[in-house]
Interface confidence: low
């Protein structure tokens, strides 16, 4: 099968170089996986000796058999068999080595369609050029953001080709990024060169804080200059507070003396004192909690007369070791509903949590979870992943504990477990979640949103979409269109308006025929690629009396890009003084490949146009 042609990431008006070799097939000398690899998943690799070549069904192989496949054996399989193997590896969650992932990727000789079924980390080794076109590349890079990019060292060719392809896919031109761009890049944002840091410091610095590896020299210099410059988001070092320094933690090594000298010394001292007293801000909580807990609470016998008969107020006077020794875990589990009414200290709650952990090492039962109350705030995402929460009442009870705060990692994990358990985001769940977190819907990935049934869209209020980016609206819009399809014109527009950031050009053209008078705030949130093909007349009909607002927005997307595509004559008919359209005497060459990348048409000035006209004239006379 012919593969898509390679394309330059940022082309000029010239024809893009053609090339169809997208996957380099390396002949790898393969070694059997070492014991450390087998040990990673706690499985010994079984010798394969042809087991992949012709099993009745690859998915029937055990993880142990799948673990040790050598590349030589994969090389002999058909593409279909390789795809089956990749899917089986994903389903059985088999941990693969970099060499195995690379080998599989090279054998998938055409762009796989079922990206969601493949092992997430395998995508890092696929050639992004094979996913050309906005839909294919969006699907590909939306998945890539969830993969562990750090499997590949920074210098690896596979990693180096991902960033430019991702930038092209998300339509990033130049070095100016929005917060949504940075989010869409996921771990690849850590690879952005210094010029991006310099131009997009306000959105990029907060992301670089959490990059796992050290920044390169170029990035460090740009970050240092941005921080010293005192621009957003952190402001001048002379105004930093302890919480600013906490927020900057991953960038502290790049600060340098001039910056450190300009931070108020009292702040530096307070921050040093706090971080030496409480190192937890630098480490995952669990790694420091357990050892400390075990040292402080030793197994000691309960003093006579102190054995707890029930969970009541008297327990607040118990020392931590007494709680450990005198409270029976089973009693605690049956009387969890009382814990919330008793003003235990956080340290005492640690002890109670520890007792429940020992009683239920595989995860708490729902009867206990429902009554956790403030003890829920002590749970880690790892604890919550062991739970099976099926009751909406349990979910509400735990969300109530966190009410008024931002969505914590614990809450996000809880919601994820609950929704996965239900199989889809039904209307009752969505109602509950958006009541507690109006921004909830927009915190989901496009893949997660795809499980929202159209019937649930009726529960969505305009403010629930406030924080959605275009990729999320792309998923929600078709569902909303389906949900509201039986409404009449004006009612339909009122309902669909919040979702229009995901509408394609055809639907905007259709709306322009219905006298909807779209306001400019809605128009400014439409997809640029959907607005570009609209004619001046269509935009005029779409906006109605609001068309006058275009003048105020002529330098902002999508209006700016749309103006560049219109003939100046047509723009002049609006009488708004819009400038920047295509002048008379210019010929528009619609090079679709180029345009998809740059978003602007290629213009030939009067010189070449005269040549074209002369040729046309000559051929007519002939």
């Amino acid at each position: 099968m012919a593969l898509p042609t390679a394309r330059p990431l940022l082309g000029s008006c010239g024809t893009p170089a053609l090339g169809s070799l997208l996957f380099l097939l390396f002949s790898l000398g393969w070694v059997q996986p070492s014991r450390t690899l087998a040990g990673e998943t706690g499985q010994e690799a079984a010798p394969l000796d042809g087991v992949l070549a012709n099993p009745p069904n690859i998915s029937s192989l055990s993880p142990r058999q799948l673990l040790g496949f050598p590349c030589a054996e994969v090389s002999g399989l058909s593409t279909e068999r390789v795809r089956e193997l990749a899917v089986a590896l994903a389903q059985k969650n088999v941990k693969l080595s970099t060499e195995q992932l690379r080998c599989l990727a090279h054998r998938l000789s055409e762009p796989p369609e079922d990206l969601d079924a493949l092992p997430l980390d395998l995508l890092l080794f696929l050639n992004p050029d094979a996913f050309s076109g906005p839909q294919a590349c969006t699907r590909f890079f939306s998945r890539i953001t969830k993969a562990n990019v750090d499997l590949l060292p920074r210098g690896a060719p596979e990693r180096q080709r991902l960033l430019p392809a991702a930038l092209a896919c998300w339509g990033v031109r130049g070095s100016l990024l929005s917060e949504a761009d940075v989010r869409a890049l996921g771990g690849l944002a850590c690879d952005l060169p210094g010029r991006f840091v310099a131009e997009s410091a306000e959105v990029l610095l907060p992301r670089l804080v959490s990059c796992p590896g050290p920044l390169d020299q170029d990035q460090q210099e740009a970050a240092r200059a941005a921080l010293q410059g005192g621009g957003p988001p952190y402001g001048p070092p002379s105004t930093w507070s302890v919480s600013t320094m906490d927020a900057l933690r991953g960038l502290l090594p790049v600060l340098g003396q001039p910056i450190i000298r300009s931070i108020p010394q009292g702040i530096v001292a307070a921050w040093r004192q706090r971080s030496s007293r409480d190192p937890s801000w630098r480490q995952p909580e669990r790694t420091i909690l357990r050892p400390r807990f075990r040292r402080e609470v030793e197994k000691t016998a309960c003093p006579s007369g102190k054995k707890a008969r029930e969970i009541d107020e008297s327990l607040i006077f118990y020392k931590k070791w007494e709680l450990e020794a005198c409270v029976d875990a089973a009693l605690l589990a049956t009387q969890m509903d009382r814990v919330n009414a008793i003003p235990f200290t956080y340290e005492q709650l640690d002890v109670l949590k520890h007792k429940l952990d020992e009683l239920y090492p595989q995860g708490y039962p729902e009867s206990v979870i429902q009554h956790l109350g403030y003890l829920f705030l002590k749970m880690s995402p790892e604890d919550i992943r062991k739970w099976n929460v099926t009751s909406l009442e349990t979910l509400k009870a735990l969300l109530e504990v966190n009410k008024g705060h931002e969505m914590s990692p614990q809450v996000a994990t809880l919601i994820d477990r609950f929704v996965k358990g239900r199989g889809q985001l039904d209307k009752d769940t969505l109602d509950t979640l958006t009541a507690f977190y109006p921004g909830y819907l927009c915190s989901l990935s496009p893949e997660e949103l795809s499980s929202v049934p159209p019937s649930s869209i009726w529960a969505v209020r305009p403010q629930d979409l406030d924080t959605c980016d275009p990729r999320q609206l792309d998923v929600l819009y078709p569902k909303a269109r389906l949900a509201f399809q039986n409404m009449n014109g004006s009612e339909y527009f009122v309902k669909i308006q919040s979702f229009l950031g995901g509408a394609p050009t055809e639907d905007l053209k259709a709306l322009s025929q219905q006298n909807v008078s779209m306001d400019l705030a809605t128009f400014m949130k439409l997809r640029t690629d959907a607005v570009l093909p609209l004619t001046v007349a269509e935009v005029q009909k779409l906006l109605g009396p609001h068309v006058e607002g275009l003048k105020a927005e002529e330098r902002h997307r999508p209006v700016r890009d749309w103006i560049l595509r219109q003939r100046q004559d047509d723009l002049d008919t609006l009488g708004l003084g819009l400038q920047g359209g295509i002048p008379n005497g210019y010929l528009v060459l619609d090079l679709s490949m180029q345009e998809a990348l740059s978003g602007t048409p290629c213009l030939l000035g009067p010189g070449p146009v005269l040549t074209v006209l002369a040729l046309l004239l000559a051929s007519t006379l002939a």
Partner: nanobody, 127 residues
Framework: QVKLEESGGGLVQAGGSLRISCAAS????????MGWFRQTPGKEREFVAA????????YYADSVKGRFTISRDNAKNTGYLQMNSLKPEDTAVYFC????????????????????WGQGTQVTVSS
């Protein structure tokens, strides 16, 4: 770039009301979450309230819930903070702030998560 300018501050009796405004120039504020913070001498800036770009969702500090109302008029490129039942402890310089968008991983209450700031307007509540 967005430039923000607060106005409407002044002296008011305890129990009274005041409405302060934040006018934005440079570009449309409809892309921005807006927030109000306040600061008293020697203390850190304290979060007061924030509002999403459509005006559909508002967030408040516990200390002002039920007394203060944040709103915005995107057409006028202006944000507002209506302060009722004012108390002497509400005395502070009030700053208007804007941020590019709301990312659930960052807090609306952290001043360093806001991209643009005004110069502030003094509100004094006498007892």
């Amino acid at each position: 770039q967005v430039k923000l300018e607060e106005s409407g501050g002044g002296l008011v009796q305890a129990g009274g009301s005041l409405r302060i405004s934040c006018a934005a120039s440079g570009r449309s504020i409809s892309d921005y979450f807006m927030g109000w913070f306040r600061q008293t001498p020697g203390k850190e800036r304290e979060f007061v309230a924030a509002i999403s770009w459509s005006g559909g969702t508002a967030y408040y500090a516990d200390s002002v819930k039920g007394r203060f109302t944040i709103s915005r008029d995107n057409a006028k490129n202006t944000g507002y903070l209506q302060m009722n039942s004012l108390k002497p402890e509400d005395t502070a310089v009030y700053f208007c702030a804007a941020r590019l968008s709301y990312d659930s991983r960052t807090s609306l209450q952290n001043s360093y998560d806001y991209n643009y700031w005004g110069q502030g307007t003094q509100v004094t509540v006498s007892s």
